[in-house]
Amino acid sequence: SQPQAVPPYASENQTCRDQEKEYYEPQHRICCSRCPPGTYVSAKCSRIRDTVCATCAENSYNEHWNYLTICQLCRPCDPVMGLEEIAPCTSKRKTQCRCQPGMFCAAWALECTHCELLSDCPPGTEAELKDEVGKGNNHCVPCKAGHFQNTSSPSARCQPHTRCENQGLVEAAPGTAQSDTTCKNPLEPLPPEMSGTMLM
């Protein structure tokens, strides 16, 4: 078997064996090593010497195999834009941010740049559960049969109606999507002016 070429090596067709870890240098028509994540090019390659890499200085990073001559500056998550940190910046990865609780991403440019408050879901509805928190605004869906939700809230969940018989009571008024079942003591009639979820 033919020995594997080690950078720097000549390339006539302008392509390199390992696209992730090597790049084509057109001036010398050679393939040179890229620098690994967390490093940058401190000396470019030549026909007789491969790329020399150096580690990124503190508070900077490069995420990919690269032939950059600088590292990118770490940026904090901007709380004014509604963002919070979920993982710190290291030499190999930028700071990872997400929307603060109760917010969703309203502006996206490769990553989220601005979060806004989730809209309220009115009584009788709840926010549809999403795969990823903070990805989009609330989509309110009606409570399913036998459930209610009685507030305007971005996060309140529909709750099952109270089962009066479980408490030794009887139903005085059925539950709706916006209110719980009203229960009463089986021995007492329910006066028409009385309301509330439980009458004793």
Epitope: A57, E63, K94
Partner: antibody, heavy 121, light 113 residues
Framework: EVQLVESGGGLVQPGGSLRLSCAAS????????MSWVRQAPGKGLEWVSG????????NYADSVKGRFTISRDNSKNTLYLQMNSLRAEDTAVYYC??????????????WGQGTMVTVSS | DIVMTQSPDSLAVSLGERATINCKSS????????????LTWYQQKPGQPPKLIIY???TRESGVPDRFSGSGSGTDFTLTISSLQAEDVAVYYC?????????FGQGTKVEIK
């Protein structure tokens, strides 16, 4: 040759203090984060504390927060761990470990041989 | 904290046979921006410090024999020793470095059957 050598371990009474040192050689010490990782007898590995290359960022496991302090002297190529209010459960071999990063959140590519800390009355 | 769970706790394999160790993280450790899993494997022989053998979940550290390989993504990872040698008897640990604090699995002891 890249090398880490720990020292300062020993027997100490509960409530006592100890200062561990880790002398580094063979690499640009100030460019890399360092951590302390411990291993109780017959048990697994537990990260204790980490410090960034400049010393500007530090972090601690909840189990040692407020009792242990990590520091470094880049002019002496030395990492330290000041351990106060020691408890029996701190008994372990303490390893210093180098990260391939200025941040301690990375793979630990070089480890020292470890120094034994025994907390007992 | 991200919890790392290894299985099995120990395994005995005949010389020349395959050994497989699993590691599961309680949270995703794949960073979508660079498609890298922030997971490493260490080998610890009796009386010695741990030694890095795999990083980025599947990249072998230089000098590590090619019988060691790492695979998996997201939350489920595997370390495979394709043909167990006597010198591979050790405890193997996975570790995530996706988020602070870095956390280790409880270890898997590999012995010869």
């Amino acid at each position: 040759e890249v090398q880490l050598v720990e020292s300062g371990g020993g027997l100490v009474q509960p409530g006592g203090s100890l200062r561990l040192s880790c002398a580094a050689s063979g690499f640009t010490f100030s460019s890399y984060a360092m951590s302390w990782v411990r291993q109780a007898p017959g048990k697994g590995l537990e990260w204790v504390s980490g410090i960034s290359g400049s010393g500007g960022r530090t972090n601690y496991a909840d189990s040692v927060k407020g009792r242990f302090t990590i520091s470094r002297d880049n002019s002496k190529n030395t990492l330290y761990l000041q351990m106060n209010s020691l408890r029996a459960e701190d008994t372990a071999v303490y390893y210093c470990a180098k990260s391939d990063n200025w941040h301690y959140l990375d793979a630990f590519d070089i480890w020292g041989q470890g120094t034994m800390v025994t907390v007992s009355s | 904290d991200i919890v790392m769970t290894q299985s099995p706790d120990s395994l005995a394999v005949s010389l020349g046979e395959r050994a497989t160790i699993n590691c599961k993280s309680s949270q995703n450790v794949l960073y979508s921006s660079n498609n890298k899993n922030y997971l490493t494997w260490y080998q610890q022989k009796p009386g010695q410090p741990p030694k890095l053998i795999i990083y980025w979940a599947s990249t072998r550290e230089s000098g590590v024999p090619d019988r060691f390989s790492g695979s998996g993504s997201g939350t489920d990872f595997t370390l495979t020793i394709s043909s167990l040698q006597a010198e591979d008897v050790a405890v193997y640990y996975c570790q995530q470095y996706f988020n602070t604090p870095p956390t280790f699995g409880q270890g898997t002891k590999v012995e010869i059957k």
